[in-house]
């Protein structure tokens, strides 16, 4: 079997064996090593010497195998765009951002660039639970049978109707999707002015 070529090596067809970790250098028509994440090219390759890499300076990073001669500036998450930091920048990774609580990603360009407030879900509904927080706006779904939700809110969850008998009470009015069951003392008639749940 042929020995594996080690950079730098000649390439007539302008392609390299390992596209992730090597690149074609057209001036010398050779394949050279890229620099690993967290580093940059401090000396370009030649026919007799491979790429020389150096570590990114403080406050900078390179995320991928690269042939950049410089590193990218670490930047903060922009709070005005509704973003917050979940992990600081390192030499190998840019600052990791996510939408602030109560917001969703409204503009995506390789990563989230702009978050907006989640829409309210009206009474009788709740936001459908998503796999990933902040990924999309609220999709409001009706409360399931036996549950209610009585506010306009982006995050309120449907709650089970009160079971009057559990409290030694009797039902005065059934619960709806927007209101809880109304309970009363079994010994007393419900006064006309009383509306809403009787709390023990």
């Amino acid at each position: 079997s042929q020995p594996q070529a080690v950079p730098p090596y000649a390439s007539e067809n302008q392609t390299c064996r390992d596209q992730e970790k090597e690149y074609y250098e057209p001036q010398h028509r050779i394949c050279c090593s890229r620099c690993p994440p967290g580093t940059y090219v401090s000396a370009k390759c030649s026919r007799i010497r491979d790429t020389v890499c150096a570590t990114c300076a403080e406050n900078s990073y390179n995320e991928h195998w690269n042939y950049l001669t410089i590193c990218q500036l670490c930047r903060p998450c922009d709070p005005v765009m509704g973003l917050e930091e979940i992990a600081p920048c390192t030499s190998k990774r840019k600052t990791q951002c996510r939408c602030q609580p109560g917001m969703f990603c409204a503009a995506w360009a390789l990563e989230c660039t702009h978050c907006e407030l989640l829409s309210d879900c009206p009474p009788g509904t709740e936001a459908e639970l998503k796999d990933e927080v902040g990924k999309g706006n609220n999709h409001c779904v009706p409360c399931k049978a036996g549950h209610f939700q009585n506010t306009s809110s982006p995050s309120a969850r449907c709650q089970p109707h009160t079971r009057c008998e559990n409290q030694g009470l009797v039902e005065a009015a059934p619960g709806t999707a927007q209101s809880d069951t109304t309970c009363k003392n079994p010994l007393e008639p419900l006064p006309p002015e009383m509306s809403g749940t009787m709390l023990m």
Epitope: Y67, L68, T69, I70, Q72, L73, R75, P76, D78, T95
Partner: antibody, heavy 120, light 113 residues
Framework: QVQLVQSGAEVKKPGSSVKVSCKAS????????ISWVRQAPGQGLEWMGG????????NYAQKFQGRVTITADKSTSTAYMELSSLRSEDTAVYYC?????????????WGQGTTVTVSS | DIVMTQSPDSLAVSLGERATINCKSS????????????LAWYQQKPGQPPKLLIY???TRESGVPDRFSGSGSGTDFTLTISSLQAEDVAVYYC?????????FGQGTKVEIK
Amino acid sequence: QVQLVQSGAEVKKPGSSVKVSCKASGGTFSSYAISWVRQAPGQGLEWMGGIIPIHGTANYAQKFQGRVTITADKSTSTAYMELSSLRSEDTAVYYCARPSYYLDGWLDYWGQGTTVTVSS
Amino acid sequence: DIVMTQSPDSLAVSLGERATINCKSSQSVLYSSNNKNYLAWYQQKPGQPPKLLIYWASTRESGVPDRFSGSGSGTDFTLTISSLQAEDVAVYYCSQYYTTHYTFGQGTKVEIK
């Protein structure tokens, strides 16, 4: 020493387009973001957008979105800024600029500027 | 975008006197993780492109005379020329690079009184 040399002055009619070039020498062209900044007569500096040649991705100011196109040709170490649907308010000096210490940091190298006059 | 506001718009100072220019950003340009302010100052003379004077709010670019100094943090910044020279007559701009959408102040014109 890094140098950014821009194309010559242009006179354009309203509604037409202009394409300004910026040729870099003395440094690694593709590793640095090139920004375009304009300055109307007697006015301040206004960032229009930029491109990282090695990635080919451009990034535009909201004000110019849809009207400006920034490109780069790595083989000639040249960046281009094309502005369409020209109006008289686009009369300005257009500069290309790039950082030196970071790929996308503060701007420390500037071209000499290209005067674009929009007049009927 | 971050809005940068400079004051005053123009300033007349006697030769050898101190000139002070202020710059305010609409939001903080301080990155708490590295405690750096993403702010630069530029000088522009008539018919010339801008020239970088200061970055990281207070670090002088090499070759810039030490009479130029930058200070401030968060949203409030100052460029000081400790002893104005004739060659300092120019327009001065602050600029943020906290986001990749760079923005500039409207400029402050410095003249000799």
